[in-house]
């Protein structure tokens, strides 16, 4: 029997210092492209090395991002939501949802002899 | 990860023109940011054309002679090259990466790219 798969969701608020190249990721999403099934919100899909974000070491991939300097992101275009990154200065407050996968074991009792997978 | 797959190189006359694809694998294709880059035996590899959610951009090498374009439906990004010079012989290399950056894009920059296709040949014979 297979476990459920079940997420840890936790939000986080992270003060990145904009760095020589920028604050260093790449996003997806807004209203015009949806990354998530029915979520038209933004999300990390890249940290790049050595940059503030990296170095920072707190973003992830796959974090969505609720706002930005107090501003929400939600209902924004995707260009609109880079635009709103480009223009939020040198320190930039990030509030973030992390989405943890945790792994549940098989549902019901499990034996002696059964694996520990 | 991420695959990408170049074709439609050839051999061509100067003056002639070639429609270069590159297929890529993945679910969210219309979100890539995608570049073709070349490189020219002993030479420094070189930026051609890039395309992202929000526009077009291209060396002044190519510009006017050269189109970049994709189709999301079909997971794949184009090079129509018209108007081909001997010059433009070179392997022709697709680039991508998940998402737009948050900062200035720097399409010429490889470092913007994480994935890379093998190429295709593509000579123009005078």
């Known amino acids: 029997m297979n476990g459920r798969v079940d997420y840890l969701v936790t939000e986080e608020e992270i003060n990145l210092t904009r760095g020589p190249s920028g604050l260093g990721f790449n996003i997806v999403g807004g209203t015009d492209q949806q990354y998530v099934s029915n979520d038209s919100g933004i999300y990390v899909s890249r940290i790049k090395e050595n940059g503030a974000a990296a170095l920072d070491g707190r973003l992830q991939e796959g974090d969505k991002i609720l706002s930005v300097n107090g501003q929400d992101l939600k209902n924004l275009l995707h260009q609109d939501a880079v635009d709103l990154f480009r223009n939020a200065g040198y320190a930039v407050s990030l509030r973030v949802q992390h989405r943890l996968q945790v792994q549940n074991g098989p549902i019901g009792h499990r034996g002696e002899g059964d694996p520990s997978g | 990860d991420v695959q990408l797959v170049e074709s439609g190189g050839g051999l061509v006359q100067a003056g002639g023109s070639l429609r270069l694809s590159c297929t890529a694998s993945?679910?969210?294709?219309?979100?890539?940011?995608m570049a073709w880059f070349r490189q020219a035996p002993g030479k420094e590899r070189e930026f051609v054309a890039a395309?992202?959610?929000?526009?077009?951009y291209y060396a002044d090498s190519v510009k006017g002679r050269f189109t970049i374009s994709r189709d999301n439906a079909k997971n794949t990004m184009y090079l129509q090259m018209n108007s081909l010079k001997p010059e433009d012989t070179a392997v022709y290399i697709c680039?991508?990466?998940?998402?737009?950056?948050?900062?200035?894009?720097?399409?010429?920059?490889?470092?913007?790219?994480?994935?890379w296709g093998q190429g295709t040949q593509v000579t123009v014979s005078s």
């Open positions: 395309i992202t959610w929000s526009g077009t």
């Open positions: 993945g679910r969210t294709f219309s979100t890539y940011t």
């Open positions: 680039a991508a990466v998940i998402g737009s950056t948050v900062d200035s894009y720097s399409p010429s920059d490889p470092l913007e790219y994480d994935y």
